[in-house]
């Protein structure tokens, strides 16, 4: 516990209890202490979301969430004379804020968004039932490193879904990551409702496809040798080498984390290389190597996308059938 | 051959500190992770956490964050798993493992015993 | 965080019968960072398969894996007296509780 002593008696309530939106899914709720607080009372602040999650006890007179604003949220706030969760707090007061105005049917739907190769943010999304197909639509933007607001200029369409990407680059500061980039959708007309999305950005990362340099035999053993892409450390991928071999039919899958090119077959010392040595392979046939990345999920919370494959390299024969 | 030795057997009393070391050997330290388990007696593996000795990046299950510290010198190829101060219920076997970016143990310690007692 | 459950906690079967385990994890897992272990009394676990379906170095072919989302199998196509054991299913932070394989 903390605070100074807790009087029997409840608090009164807070005043002034206000809310506001900054950026594009920060809320801010503040409010002023209670008028006619006991004296002796050193104040806290209980409050929690109207669904009675995130339940906090503190000393500050505001209280913020990053959270989209697709849907009605609302805070509850009151006065206790202690850090303790059991002392009855004050009546409760509730400040709620909706979203913007407009015909939920209208707004977009699964907007997605993914951080290609640390590089640039492609976001997608389908177009909402109740929507003319000649809607222009808006994609705004921001993250902490940005003063303000950005508005997407790329807007494309791939089929039923429209898009638009914009460069987000992996800032040195170690933090940048554990922080989450606000996405808004409307059209410029005003008619459909908004659409709101937060992407952490330890989520739905997609490395660049590796690009394979030299494949070459040594006895029985095939050496690749590959590019790693760019922006990522070496504890954060992971590849899937893949070899298929035209006279036995067979595909056979190789995971590879030691990457270092550091055998006598492959070309040394070059920048951002990754080697590996694939065992029994027969060097009278043909062989296809392609390769692939993807994140390690300790350092990127997203597990499930994969790189595209590199393009294909061959080395070996291809034996006439006889 | 990569192999993981771990230091021996400790029995401790309630408050102390321990420090147990786990040494790695037959391939590159720096390029793969060490996770440690915890295994309590007669029950199942627990993921305690993982330390990356290349940069010393760790990370720890919810379970374990701030109950142990996780470090490694890669000068001596070693990682280790401390305690501040000991409980009872930290009496099990340790092992550490050598953990590729895709998450299995592939290779293991033989274990460390760690009896807290009175 | 994602929960492994696995089934059954014990089965009961005869040198050169098949086994089939069964892992279920609490939401779509990529079979990537699935793998399988095997642990015998006073020992350390083995790897046996990452990925979901690689048979680590060393392992013999009568144990595979398969799988994909929530869903995964290990299987031991003809038991040895040496794979009567614990084994247990990994996804990073997440072990399952174990099924052991007992002689009948």
């Known amino acids: 516990g903390g605070g100074g002593a807790a009087p029997t008696e409840t608090q009164p309530p807070v005043t002034n209890l206000s809310v506001s939106v900054e950026n594009l899914c920060t809320v801010i709720w503040t409010w002023n202490p209670p008028e006619g607080a006991s004296s002796n009372c050193s104040l806290w602040y209980f409050s929690h979301f109207g669904d009675k999650q995130d339940k906090k006890i503190a000393p500050e007179t505001r209280r913020s969430i990053e959270v989209p604003l697709n849907e009605r949220i609302c805070l509850q706030v009151g006065s206790q004379c202690s850090t303790n969760e059991s002392e009855k707090p004050s009546i409760l007061v509730e400040k709620c804020i909706s979203p913007p105005e407009g015909d939920p049917e209208s707004a977009v739907t699964e907007l997605q968004c993914i951080w290609h190769n640390l590089s640039y943010m492609k976001c997608s999304w389908l177009p909402g039932r109740n929507t003319s197909p000649d809607t222009n639509y808006t994609l705004y933007y921001w993250h902490r490193s940005l003063e303000k607001i950005h508005q997407c200029e790329n807007i494309f369409r791939e089929g039923q879904y429209f898009g638009c990407s914009f460069d987000l680059t992996k800032v040195k500061d170690s933090s940048f990551e554990q922080h989450s980039v606000q996405i808004m959708v409307k059209d410029n007309a005003g008619k459909i409702k908004p659409s709101f999305n937060i992407v952490p950005l330890t989520s739905r990362v997609k490395p660049d496809p590796p690009h394979i340099k030299n494949l070459s035999f040594h006895n029985d053993d095939l050496y690749v040798q590959w590019e790693n892409p760019q922006n990522f450390i070496s504890r954060c991928l992971f590849y899937e080498v893949e070899v298929n071999n035209s006279q036995t039919e067979t595909h056979n899958v190789f995971y590879v984390q030691e990457a270092k090119c550091e055998n006598p077959e492959f070309e040394r010392n070059v920048e951002n290389t990754s080697c590996f040595m694939v065992p029994g392979v027969l060097p009278d046939t043909l062989n296809t190597v392609r390769i692939r990345v993807k994140t390690n999920k300790l350092c990127y919370e997203d597990d499930k996308l994969w790189s595209n494959w590199s393009q294909e390299m061959s080395i070996g024969k291809k034996r006439n059938s006889t | 051959e990569v192999q993981l030795v771990q230091s021996g057997a400790e029995v401790k009393k309630p408050g102390e500190s321990l420090k147990i070391s786990c040494k790695g050997s037959?391939?590159?330290?720096?390029?793969?992770?060490i996770g440690w388990v915890r295994q309590m007696p007669g029950k199942g593996l627990e993921w305690m956490g993982v330390i990356y000795p290349g940069d010393s990046y760790t990370r720890y299950s919810p379970s374990f964050q701030g109950q142990v510290t996780i470090s490694a010198d890669k000068s001596i190829s070693t990682a280790y798993l401390q305690w501040s101060s000991l409980k009872a219920s930290d009496t099990a076997m340790y092992y550490c493992?050598?953990?590729?970016?895709?998450?299995?143990?592939?290779?293991w310690g033989q274990g460390t015993l760690v009896t807290v007692s009175s | 965080e994602i929960v492994l459950t696995q089934s059954p906690g014990t089965l009961s079967l005869s040198p050169g019968e098949r086994a089939t385990l069964s892992c279920r994890a609490s939401?779509?897992?990529?079979?990537?960072?699935l793998a399988w272990y095997q642990q015998k009394p006073g020992q350390a676990p083995r790897l046996l398969i990452y990925?979901?379906?690689s048979r680590a170095t060393g392992i013999p072919d009568r144990f595979s894996g398969s799988g994909s989302g929530t869903d995964f199998t290990l299987t031991i196509s003809r038991l040895e007296p040496e794979d009567f054991a614990v084994y247990y299913c990994?996804?990073?932070?997440?072990f399952g509780q174990g099924t052991k394989v007992e002689i009948k």
């Open positions: 990994q996804q990073y932070a997440s």
């Open positions: 037959g391939y590159s330290f720096t390029s793969y992770w």
């Open positions: 493992a050598r953990m590729p970016n895709w998450g299995s143990l592939d290779h």
């Open positions: 939401q779509s897992i990529s079979s990537s960072y």
């Open positions: 990925g979901a379906s």
